[in-house]
């Protein structure tokens, strides 16, 4: 869509005559009647297929033609085209004399025409005013055309639609070639895309104008870069949303079970060497001189009676000494200075030489020990301790110090490993002679029913058109990270496309 | 008196150039597109080019396109067509004409001869 | 381009009877035709143009008519003057072109 304009200069009739030659009474009030057509290889008398336009009276005889554009006149004369422009044309101006005020064709006499030109034109769209001179032997015009586009039409045949906008269906101004250029923050065809903050990731980030970062459902940061790990993870990080990859020396679902409860919390004393033996569990190798679970306990070396024929034990810094009695000497007063003439059998023993009388050795009646059977038996020695406890005499008792998971006076009793309920998501624990065993519900397995083998949200592939699916593994739900341009819950829904022309 | 008169006809080796002018008077040449027509021996009328008034649009027939050009002087109301690379079949005889058909003008020369022969 | 076809290529009448012939396009030319007549060593001769409008001089004998793609040169009593060749030519777009001619010669 667009206007020919034609600038109408001057005319010269310098005698007032009209085309037969006859003078004008009293002189030739001159108009004027423009038709303009299609381009004719000959030009030929034929419909005005581009418009039709008539002036009023402009003058008398020979005159000058006033521009009024800016005063909302009809000078430059105005031919609106509702086409592609083609480039050239056929023009024809004619110059009629009236007689009185109707200027109707009708109503003038044929012999009232003074002059006709008949053109065939080439004109680009937005040339300069293109001047043309038409002379007769009797007249002669002056008149200049140009073509523009209408408002919001460009292009070199003003037939590209474009009008500026900022609004939901785009922001943009038209360039002089109908092309759109959009305003700044905008992209796309239409310029209805608007360009993130700088940086922000291109799949989990998004934004609804311009310098805005949004992030998508399982990413967070200033840049949507950063994954969310699964809800309730504690000890663990992610690559991919909803993921809880455990720190080194935690472990489970969640990454809330210490598999390194040695380093985490130091359980062992008295310098006691640490062992991880499984979740929340240890082991202590304690120092010589300590025991107890943790090595807390400081163990007394003259517990084990090593003392011999009745020498008494004294405790030491960096050991034991044994003081002997007469008659004994050695580390544990082993060596005897006596003869069977001394009567060294205590408790009814029996004595016997040896060596020739140099030494000798007592039979000890049943419920005595030693080497002078000066020692009630020791109750420890008959290992009454069960499961590897170890026997400790306190003066004329006896107690068991049992391993980890044994109880009992003499650890016979296993302690219940299921006591700590190990088993995770509702598992049934199972006391077995060396530990324990989880019957794990549907949806899960492993030692302790720690592993979720419940079926993945995402198997079914239920997001459309592309989308990543992540399992949120506390509802067994899935969750659809859409591609840009889809919405809805399973990205379903495609965002309305504008159609060509969207104004 | 109208009259368009051409010149510059003649016998041409194939390959060789000519120009051929057409000199108008009694009418206003720079008002009128301008056109040579040519008629070779024993066949009908054939169109050749066109110049528009001012001389801003030209149109040839394909057959001469890139060797005939067609321009005017409207200072010398004279019209031209500069013949490059003859062939025979360009053998026929050349008018100039002035046809305004809505202005009822219809001009046409006299005609002048051109034969290309070896 | 236009192709115009004349038909008859030659036209036999005798003088003072009426003349028909014909010209067709190949594509509608929207009334830009004219018709010549042509005489052996004379310049075309325009007797119609607009396909029906008669030249300035020309006899009223000689009219045109049609429309679209199809014309018609009628001469109502022919004169021994009329017997030549007569061409219609198509002014709608470039190339030009000519029909091919019809004689008309005295039968």
């Known amino acids: 869509s667009g206007v020919f304009q034609l600038q109408l200069q001057e005319f010269i009739n310098e005698r007032g005559v009209l085309a037969s030659g006859r003078p004008c009474e009293p002189g030739c009030r001159t108009f004027f009647r423009v038709c303009l057509k299609h381009f004719q290889a000959v030009v030929s008398p034929g419909p005005c297929t581009f418009g039709t336009v008539s002036t009023p009276v402009l003058g008398t005889n020979s005159f000058a033609v006033r521009d009024d554009s800016s005063g909302g006149g009809r000078n430059p004369l105005q031919l609106p085209f509702n086409f592609t422009w083609p480039g050239t044309f056929s023009l024809i101006i004619e110059a009629w004399h009236a007689p009185g005020d109707d200027l109707r064709p009708e109503a003038l006499p044929p012999d009232a025409l003074i002059s006709k030109i008949a053109i065939q034109g080439s004109l680009a769209v937005g040339q300069n005013w293109l001047l043309d001179e038409q002379t007769s032997t009797l007249t002669r015009l002056r008149y200049s055309y140009r073509v523009i586009c209408s408002d919001n039409y460009y292009g070199d045949n003003c037939s590209r639609l474009c009008k500026k906008r900022n609004d939901h269906f785009g922001h943009y101004v038209c360039q002089p070639d109908g092309n759109l250029s959009c305003l700044p923050g905008w992209t796309g065809e239409y310029c209805q895309q608007p360009i993130c903050l700088s940086g922000c990731h291109e799949q989990n980030g998004y934004c609804s104008k311009p310098a805005e970062c949004l992030c998508r459902p399982g990413w967070q940061g200033r840049l949507c870069n950063e994954c969310i790990p699964h809800n309730g993870c504690r000890h663990g990080t992610c690559s991919t949303p909803w993921q809880c990859t455990c720190d080194e020396g935690w472990g489970g679902l969640f990454c809330d079970q210490d598999l390194n409860y040695c380093t985490h919390h130091s359980p062992c004393k008295n310098g006691a060497t640490c062992s991880n033996s499984g979740q929340r569990s240890y082991t202590c190798t304690c120092r010589p001189g300590y025991t107890g679970v943790d090595c807390e306990l400081e163990l007394s070396e003259c517990d084990s009676n090593p003392c011999r024929n009745g020498g008494s034990c004294k405790d030491q810094e960096d050991g034991y000494h044994c003081l002997c009695p007469p008659g004994y000497y050695g580390l544990h007063c082993e060596h005897s200075t006596l003869s069977c003439a001394d009567s060294p059998c205590f408790n009814g023993g029996s004595c016997r030489e040896r060596n020739q009388g140099a030494n000798y050795a007592c039979e000890c009646p049943p419920n005595f020990t030693g080497s002078n059977c000066e020692k009630k038996v020791d109750r420890c020695t008959s290992n009454p301790c069960a499961n590897g406890g170890q026997c400790l005499n306190r003066g004329p008792s006896r107690m068991c110090r049992c391993r980890p998971g044994f109880t009992g006076t003499y650890c016979e009793l296993h302690v219940s490993d299921c006591a700590r309920n190990p088993c995770a998501h509702g598992g049934t624990c199972h006391d077995l002679e060396n530990g324990l065993m989880c019957t794990c519900p549907a949806g899960f397995s492993g030692r302790r029913c720690e592993v979720r083998t419940s079926i993945d949200a995402c198997a079914s592939s239920p997001c459309f058109n592309r989308a990543t699916c992540y399992t949120d593994l506390s509802t067994d739900t899935f969750v659809c990270n859409c591609p840009y341009g889809f919405v809805g819950s399973r990205c379903e829904f495609p965002v309305g496309l504008p159609p060509s022309f969207p104004w | 008196e109208v009259q368009l008169v051409e010149s510059g006809g003649g016998v041409v080796q194939p390959g060789r150039s000519l120009r051929l002018s057409c000199a108008a008077s009694g009418f206003t040449f720079s008002n009128y597109g301008m056109y040579w027509v040519r008629q070779a021996p024993g066949k009908g009328l054939e169109w050749v080019a066109f110049?528009?008034?001012?001389?801003?649009?030209?149109y040839y027939r394909d057959s001469v396109k890139g060797r005939f050009t067609i321009s005017r002087d409207n200072s010398k109301n004279t019209l031209y067509l500069q013949m490059n690379s003859l062939r025979a079949e360009d053998t026929a005889v050349y008018y100039c004409?002035?046809?305004?058909?809505?202005?009822?003008?219809?001009?046409w020369g006299q005609g002048t001869m051109v034969t290309v022969s070896s | 381009e236009i192709v115009m076809t004349q038909s008859p290529a030659t036209l036999s009448v005798s003088p003072g009877e009426r003349a028909t012939l014909s010209c067709r396009a190949s594509?509608?030319?929207?009334?830009?035709l004219a018709w010549y007549q042509k005489k052996p060593g004379q310049s075309p001769r325009l007797l119609i143009y607009a396909a029906n409008r008669l030249q300035d001089g020309v006899p009223a004998r000689f009219s045109g008519s049609g429309s679209g793609t199809e014309y018609t040169l009628t001469i109502s009593s022919l004169q021994s003057e009329d017997f030549a060749v007569y061409f219609c030519l198509q002014g709608s777009k470039f190339p030009l072109t000519f029909g091919q001619g019809t004689k008309l010669e005295i039968k």
């Open positions: 004409a002035a046809l305004n058909w809505e202005l009822g003008i219809d001009y």
């Open positions: 110049i528009s008034h001012g001389g801003g649009i030209t």
């Open positions: 594509e509608d030319i929207y009334s830009n």
